[in-house]
Each structure stands twice: as structure tokens, then as C-alpha cells.
């Protein structure tokens, strides 16, 4: 599936995301993880997802954003973190979304 550009795994029970996902799917542009059970993001989580233009993370249980998880997403146009448990609008420790 190395040519895959869109992956929809919404409405599942994914609680951990392996960073190797995007290394195995280098062409991935759209990743839909809505309605899963993710609780934390780190700067490793999407480190290899450098071509993402859309990342849908709504309706998870994300309470913690450690370090700078979106710093490598230079092409990101849409990021949806609605309906999570975030207590701050700070998406990490530095400005990441240009």
C-alpha cells in the first residue's frame, strides 16, 4: 500500500498510533482518525507524515500534546482536534502551524 494517499480508520478503538505508519505510507496526504481512543500525541507520532495535507483527530480523548507533534507537517491545510480533552489551545511547545 505504499502508494496510498488517503487512509480512513475513523470510528475504531485505536488507542496508540505507531510512528512507523507514515514511513510505510510515504505518499499519505489525508489521515482520518476521528472517533478513536487516542489520548496523547508526541513529536514522534506524526514525525514521518511529512506529506499530510489533512489530519482529522476529532472525537478522541486527546488530553496531552507533548513537545511539537505537528512541526514536520509543512503541507498541512486542515487539522481538526475538536471534541477532545484539550485544556489549552497551545499545540505543543512552539508555533508549529504556519
Amino acid at each position: 500500500y505504499s502508494q496510498l494517499t488517503s487512509l480512513d480508520v475513523g470510528f475504531n478503538t485505536i488507542s496508540k498510533l505507531e510512528p512507523e505508519l507514515c514511513q510505510k505510507l510515504p505518499m499519505l496526504k489525508v489521515l482520518n482518525l476521528q472517533h478513536n481512543e487516542l489520548s496523547q500525541l508526541s513529536d514522534k507520532t506524526f514525525a514521518f507524515c511529512t506529506n499530510l495535507t489533512e489530519l482529522h483527530l476529532m472525537s478522541n480523548s486527546i488530553q496531552k500534546i507533548k513537545n511539537n507533534p505537528f512541526v514536520k507537517q509543512k503541507n498541512l491545510i486542515t487539522l481538526d482536534l475538536s471534541h477532545n480533552g484539550l485544556s489549552s489551545t497551545k499545540l505543543g511547545t512552539q508555533v508549529q502551524l504556519e
Epitope: 489520548s39 508526541s42 514522534k44 514525525a47 485544556s87
Partner: antibody, heavy 117, light 107 residues
């Protein structure tokens, strides 16, 4: 299956150094952080520090800043910790552990370091 | 550094009994708390992360709860294999710090 392999036991003389290794199989260490934790005989756990194998960035506990040096080799998927200027109170079990979120979901079996003249 | 005060230091429980271990942080750690089990002569194993999330493969009799500065680990129905040391650990701020441990024995 993820495994963290630590080998043997180390005997060091006061003032010398030892270098411990932790070889990871079943997982690419660039995807995570490698941590080191010690446990003195009959005591609790103490965090030493962590390394990001992807770039070599390290963070140390204050107590270990001049004691431990963490390195990693992504080509062999191995993390290392060098302990310098050994003293008797460095005698402990030293564990390597993996954790993307600073809790540790995989541990090595630990290496006993004994410092004695 | 954030201090983690764990209690009790030791505990005896009968098989089938429900057991609780407490951990008090010196400041709010915002649920960045894990619990570990360490059997004699072995390395620790994570039971709970993010205060209440059960690690894959851990029996459902283990549960974690709490918020702010106060957290607890509950074992609902003590089993022989639960005899071990238990540690809490905060990952909210560096340095990562551990509680001093609870030794759980079978009565």
C-alpha cells in the same frame, strides 16, 4: 515482539567508567525515546535521563548530568549509557526502557553494576 | 522536582480482596501518571498510563483513577501473581520521578 537486550553484569573500580548497551529488536528506536533508570539494592526506581535516537538530543536528571552520557546508534538499533567517575553508591541495577510519552512500555532486564576496589 | 509520595509502603491482602494504593504528587501533574508492577528479580512492567488507561495485555482487575495531585491504583480481586512491588511515576515534568513503592504481599 519488542525486546530490549541488556547483557551480563559489570564490575568497575572507583574512578573508572563503564559503558552499558541496550539492543532493541522488533522496533525502530527512531520512533521512540530511550530512557535509563536505576535501582539501588532494595530501593526504588530513579530516572537517569533520556535520548531521542533520531537526533541525539538528551535530557538528564540533575543528579546524573556529570555522571551519565547517553548515546544511540540507529544503524544497530542500540542505546548506550556511559557512567563515569564511578563511586560505590553507583552500585545499582541499570535498566534501559522505551517510551514515546515518558512512561515506559518496554524495559530491558537490567544490568547489575558493582563498584568495588 | 515533583515529589511523588506513595502509600502504604507495604500491604498484605487475602486472595480475592480489593486493594488500593495511593500516590500524591507535590503539584498538579494533569493525569501524566503511570503505574508499574515489579516482581522479585524482574524489570518493571507498565500497568496503567495516563492515570487511567489500561496497558495492552494487563488484566482488567487493575484500574487507575485520580486527577490533579491525587491518584490511585486499584486491584479488584487479589490474585497470587499480583504479589509484587508497585510504583507510580509522573511524566508531567522533567525529571521524571517515581513514588517510593508499595510492597504487596499475600496474607
Amino acid at each position: 515482539e519488542v525486546q530490549l537486550q541488556q547483557y551480563g553484569a559489570e564490575l568497575g573500580k572507583p574512578g573508572t567508567s563503564v559503558k552499558l548497551s541496550c539492543k532493541v529488536s522488533g522496533y525502530n528506536i527512531t520512533y521512540t525515546y530511550m530512557h535509563w533508570v536505576n535501582q539501588r539494592p532494595g530501593k526504588g526506581l530513579e530516572w537517569i535521563g533520556r535520548i531521542d535516537p533520531a537526533n541525539g538530543n538528551t535530557i538528564y536528571g540533575e543528579k546524573f548530568k556529570n555522571k551519565a552520557t547517553l548515546t544511540a546508534d540507529t544503524s544497530s538499533n542500540t542505546a548506550y549509557m556511559q557512567l563515569s567517575q564511578l563511586k560505590s553508591d553507583d552500585t545499582a541495577i541499570y535498566f534501559c526502557a522505551m517510551g514515546e510519552f515518558d512512561y515506559f512500555d518496554h524495559w530491558g532486564q537490567g544490568v547489575m553494576v558493582t563498584v568495588s576496589s | 522536582d515533583i515529589q511523588m509520595t506513595q502509600s502504604p509502603a507495604s500491604l498484605s491482602a487475602s486472595l480475592g480482596e480489593t486493594v488500593s494504593i495511593e500516590c500524591l504528587a507535590s503539584e498538579d501533574i494533569s493525569n501524566d501518571l503511570a503505574w508499574y508492577q515489579q516482581k522479585s528479580g524482574k524489570s518493571p512492567q507498565v500497568l496503567i498510563y495516563a492515570a487511567s488507561r489500561l496497558e495492552d495485555g494487563v488484566p482488567s482487575r487493575f484500574s487507575g483513577s485520580g486527577s490533579g495531585t491525587r491518584y490511585s491504583l486499584k486491584i479488584s480481586g487479589m490474585q497470587p501473581e499480583d504479589e509484587a512491588d508497585y510504583f507510580c511515576q509522573q511524566s508531567y515534568k522533567y525529571p521524571v520521578t517515581f513514588g517510593s513503592g508499595t510492597k504487596l504481599e499475600i496474607k
